[in-house]
């Protein structure tokens, strides 16, 4: 089923699923100036059975200027310059959590994609916490958040995570670096937005990781 | 939580033109595709169009090219659809409906009479 | 346009019974089909998206299967609040439709 609301926002951190549950949409989403082709997919979603999962559908954009066509667009090397700004190298992660049964791995980026990537988790999705550069956390407990279900609603447990403002960067579990953040965000935003980075989960061979930093939507 | 409000029920003359409005809160109404959708008892269900708010896209059942017209107004949080050209035909119950995850309005009704 | 064929207008059970509400697709839509409940004077309450995922709140006695052209809504264990029409709808080309529901009843 799918989760009523956003994972709880903590102060001065940011969340990122490792992987995602059979059951998670992924919207298709287009960056400006590109929208989704007409009879194309709404969203991508996260399906198989127990052995194996994988994205179902695939997004497509068109450029907004050429009406009723599925022509797809090159970004121009400007784009593409844009788009690596927001890429990052980081360690490889201890553990393939996207191995998991019943889970997939980040979906790859498609052309022209948004640089906003809006999932709609499911229950029993996991999200892990860590503090913005130039925090440092200070652990209660699992600086993460499960969606459950009690009573025929959906709710997110609360991590136990506090950011405190020293200039010290706690990571991931099994991360060693600090990662760039982005910029903060008006508090005043009511619209459920969240920054949260993107893994694409290597294998053993891989010495390091793209990362890239999404502000995504979970409503 | 996510809500769609429609504003309330219309009575209008033949050939005559409509506004209907949606305003949506508990989301961010620039992210995600909002629909149109006709129901006349005997006729079921139609999808009408689709509008993007985030950059004004817009997709039109074939059908009701002409006779809608889908426009959004981000400021507000709130999707207008404008009907032309009025007939009896177009008497029905409109719904503005969230693409996906779907979210429906609770409906406007609209009846076309002299 | 696609149509999507609800070939019972109605259907008859009571309390407890299990019921299938079956959909037809004119061409193959794969899974990209979603069901809803609607009630006399209520919008449509989406129950199911992508044939089979059942939407928050949806109590798990509803049931979606299918894929390709042929889809069914299964409520297991009826209670009284399911009476209402049931209608599927396909997204998978534009424009999206749907089909011309099903009303359960008490017998």
């Known amino acids: 089923e799918l989760c009523d609301d956003d994972p709880p926002e903590i102060p001065h951190a940011t969340f990122k699923a490792m992987a995602y549950k059979e059951g998670t949409m992924l919207n298709c989403e287009c960056k400006r100036g590109f929208r989704r082709i007409k009879s194309g997919s709404l969203y991508m979603l996260c399906t198989g059975n127990s052995s194996h999962s994988s994205w179902d559908n695939q997004c497509q954009c068109t450029s907004s200027a050429t009406r009723n066509t599925t022509k797809q667009v090159t970004p121009q090397p400007e784009e593409q310059k844009e788009r690596k700004t927001t890429e990052m190298q980081s360690p490889m992660q201890p553990v393939d959590q996207a191995s998991l049964p019943g889970h997939c791995r980040e979906p790859p980026p498609w052309e022209n994609e948004a640089t906003e990537r809006i999932y709609h988790f499911v229950v029993g999705q996991m999200v892990y916490y860590q503090c913005v550069q130039g925090y440092r956390a200070l652990h209660r407990g699992p600086a993460e958040s499960v969606c459950k279900m009690t009573h025929g609603k959906t709710r997110w447990t609360q991590p136990q995570l506090i950011c405190t403002g020293e200039m010290e960067t706690s990571q991931f579990p099994g991360e060693e670096k600090p990662q760039a953040s982005p910029e903060g965000r008006p508090e005043s935003e009511t619209s459920c937005l969240v920054t949260t980075t993107d893994f694409q989960i290597q294998t053993e061979m891989a010495a390091t990781m793209e990362t890239s930093i999404f502000t995504t939507e979970y409503q | 939580q996510v809500q769609l409000q429609q504003s309330g029920a219309e009575l209008v003359r033949p050939g005559t033109s409509v506004k209907i409005s949606c305003k949506a809160s508990g989301y961010t109404f620039t992210n995600y595709w909002l629909g149109w959708v006709k129901q006349r008892p005997g006729h079921g269900l139609e999808w009408i169009g689709d509008?993007?708010?985030?950059?004004?896209?817009?997709n039109y059942n074939e059908k009701f090219k002409g006779k809608a017209t889908l426009t959004a107004d981000t400021s507000s949080s709130t999707a207008y659809m404008q009907l032309s050209s009025l007939t009896s035909e177009d008497s029905a119950v409109y719904f503005c409906?969230?693409?996906?995850?779907?979210?429906w309005g609770q409906g406007t009704s609209l009846t076309v009479s002299s | 346009d696609i149509v999507m064929t609800q070939s019972q207008k109605f259907m008859s059970t009571s309390v407890g019974d299990r019921v299938s509400v079956t959909c037809k697709a004119s061409?193959?839509?794969?899974?990209?089909v979603a069901w809803y409940q609607q009630k006399p004077g209520q919008s449509p309450k989406a129950l199911i998206y992508s044939a089979s995922y059942r939407y928050s709140g949806v109590p798990d006695r509803f049931t979606g299967s299918g894929s390709g052209t042929d889809f069914t809504l299964t409520i297991s264990n009826v209670q009284s609040e399911d009476l209402a029409e049931y209608f599927c709808?396909?997204?998978?080309?534009?424009?999206?439709?749907f089909g011309g529901g099903t009303k359960l009843e008490m017998k």
């Open positions: 509008i993007y708010p985030g950059g004004g896209y817009t």
């Open positions: 061409q193959n839509v794969g899974t990209n």
């Open positions: 709808q396909q997204y998978n080309s534009y424009p999206y439709t």
């Open positions: 409906a969230r693409v996906t995850p779907a979210s």
